[in-house]
Amino acid sequence: EPTMYGEILSPNYPQAYPSEVEKSWDIEVPEGYGIHLYFTHLDIELSENCAYDSVQIISGDTEEGRLCGQRSSNNPHSPIVEEFQVPYNKLQVIFKSDFSNEERFTGFAAYYVATDINECTDFVDVPCSHFCNNFIGGYFCSCPPEYFLHDDMKNCGVNCSGDVFTALIGEIASPNYPKPYPENSRCEYQIRLEKGFQVVVTLRREDFDVEAADSAGNCLDSLVFVAGDRQFGPYCGHGFPGPLNIETKSNALDIIFQTDLTGQKKGWKLRYHGDPMPCPKEDTPNSVWEPAKAKYVFRDVVQITCLDGFEVVEGRVGATSFYSTCQSNGKWSNSKLKCQPVDCGIPESIENGKVEDPESTLFGSVIRYTCEEPYYYMENGGGGEYHCAGNGSWVNEVLGPELPKCVPVCGVPREPFEEKQRIIGGSDADIKNFPWQVFFDNPWAGGALINEYWVLTAAHVVEGNREPTMYVGSTSVQTSRLAKSKMLTPEHVFIHPGWKLLEVPEGRTNFDNDIALVRLKDPVKMGPTVSPICLPGTSSDYNLMDGDLGLISGWGRTEKRDRAVRLKAARLPVAPLRKCKEVKVEKPTADAEAYVFTPNMICAGGEKGMDSCKGDSGGAFAVQDPNDKTKFYAAGLVSWGPQCGTYGLYTRVKNYVDWIMKTMQENSTPRED
């Protein structure tokens, strides 16, 4: 417990002190006081440096004194023989004696008292930054006007913090500028602008004078700018050492000015303003920015348009442009969106054709459609080559995005017909010689396939059966063979409007307009045994001349059989109509004069007994195309005749081309278009 005063006596005092003694006293007075220690008696064996016996006075780690020998007062009015004054409130006194004393020594008597210390003057380190005030037992610090005492109760500073600047433009200076700034202060200024504006600080070199750095380069007084996680500075010295224009990229800036106790200069002055936050002109490949500017700032909006062949894909929807806004954080909105090559996707399949897989389906890639040759060809031109266009479509130079159409090649038999062994006015034939040949089983008759959906035949074949069963692709019409061939199902029968319907068809003498069309329910797939015959052109090239040769085919009556099981064919010439008129009608059902002959009929045959007969009706009279010798067209349809084995009459198809085309057009399904 600290005391204000006390007495310290050597052991046995005032008797002689014993040998080999070591004793210590710890003196403590209250905080804020020093100690005055004084000796009134001192009688200790004398030795050099007091090595044998001594009294030692220690303050902290410092030896204040070491005493031995005898002392007497120099002042008759004072008993004090030795004294110590320490400005600390603790002191240690240590007494030591060695093993022998040649004489009898009485030791010492000492007293201590607490004394006031002047903290303001007694120490090397001044306790107060500005004014120090001593009092008994302590001191207090005080400050000049406009300064305040910090919480440590020792340091004074100016009240220069807490200012918040929100205006878009402003000026800030150190306290007292241009007079010296206060020492020992920390000034904090805050600039807080609206989001989307960055603080830009501008200084002039001559507006800055702050105590220079020490030899290690550390600023003793410093100015620091803090913007988010970025720091500019610390700055110090004569003349501003940093950039004169500081773009902080932030709407919030803290300015911190820290000074120490010494070396005040005039300080600093700065200006700031709010710049709309810039957004970088980003490199967005394959696109153009509108408007194009050297610098983009907060709230600027640009339209980013992809170059042709590129698109921006957002949520799996393709667009050619998007908008981006310069945001308050200096970043562009929609920055994840990119212009990427257009993907045209898997090319569409086409009927009776194919498209090879492209290496790529991206913009600029090329695909080629081909038709299933030799049975189909590309009707609508364009060559079949398509490229992936900028709009995401596969596009052809001629057709645009329209797909190619593979239509059957007409009039080309896989194997040409050759007259072999003579069989009563005709030859055996193979269906590959006449792939257009259609077999009707009720009535037993023929027809000609003219495209995927249509069969041409004679009106008299279908007038009695509007739902005929037809077959294609078989040379033999044996039931077992027909089961393996392709059966065609009719959707509708169209008989020429000029065909006169009779109550008793058996007595017919007028076969004018003996032509009909059968629309099929499903398209026919073409191949070596099934392929259409061409229709005649409308030009005069397709007008038949006497002697022109044509081919007929069918499973009709032969000399030996009423019906043929295997396909028969013959080559016959066109004859003048009068030749047919001159032949006497076999088993006439009316007067010979009643039989009607019109320009819609072709007369053919008469050579070597080759002729069509009952059961061949509706089959084609196929003539080589005058403009393309590789093809055959249906010049006629087996219609009627005065007598088998002579001349026969055939419906002149050329006269009905318009009706055929119109009927097919009006009754086609969209899928066939």
Partner: antibody, heavy 118, light 109 residues
């Protein structure tokens, strides 16, 4: 006549695998892009995957990407769907379909049932 | 992805009546790539109308399709007993995925 016949369906535990096949006939298989479409019991149709005619381009429904693989063998006129890491929500009748003009599916098989259950 | 919404979910009509089925896309669809399918219970779907208005092979002429952009319609001029089924619309978009509507069930009243 165009025909598509699926096979390979069955009962499988979650996390298991199945391989579906679709045998095509009656048309030139290598000329057509093909798709798999599924129908959960009592629900609507959901497209699963598409493959181009030559097999070099494939597209998948997001939820099956990385788990299912569509492939084809044009020499065998067969379409496949390899299904790995199956989940309960993959339970459905799986149809294969031929793609026609406009990527319409003009011919469908009768379907094969896949049940994923523990 | 493009979402197709069919309405109504169920349509109850009598034979001989006119039926109008609607399909609305969440964003514009090319008319070339909008198709309709008919499905009867226990059977596979059948292509019914393709590219908005083209009838598939064998589909009776009482059926018709129309529309553009986001709104498409399948119409049956005079319902026949065999027309009662579920109809799905379907769109293809090159960026995928291909999507179907949830279906409209056409039932006999």
């Amino acid at each position: 006549e165009v025909m598509l016949v699926e096979s390979g369906g069955g009962l499988v535990k979650p996390g298991g695998s199945l391989r579906l096949s679709c045998a095509a006939s009656g048309f030139t298989f290598s000329n057509y892009a093909m798709s798999w479409v599924r129908q959960a019991p009592g629900k609507g149709l959901e497209w699963v995957a598409t493959i181009s005619s030559g097999g070099s381009h494939t597209y998948y429904l997001d939820s099956v990407k990385g788990r299912f693989t569509i492939s084809r063998d044009n020499s065998k006129d067969t379409l496949y769907l390899q299904m790995n890491s199956l989940r309960a929500e993959d339970t459905a009748l799986y149809y294969c379909a031929r793609l026609f003009t406009g990527h319409a599916m003009d011919y469908w098989g009768q379907g094969t049932l896949v049940t994923v259950s523990s | 992805q493009i979402v197709l919404t069919q309405s109504p979910a169920t349509l109850s009509l009598s034979p001989g009546e006119r039926a109008t089925l609607s399909c609305t896309a969440s964003s514009s669809v090319s008319s070339s790539y909008l198709h309709w399918y008919q499905q009867k219970p226990g059977k596979a779907p059948k292509l019914w109308i393709y590219s908005t208005s083209n009838l598939a092979s064998g589909v009776p002429s009482r059926f018709s399709g129309s529309g553009s952009g986001t709104d498409y319609t399948l119409t049956i001029s005079s319902l026949q007993p065999e027309d009662f089924a579920t109809y799905y619309c379907h769109q293809y978009y090159r960026l995928h995925p291909i999507t179907f509507g949830q279906g409209t069930k056409l039932e006999i009243k």
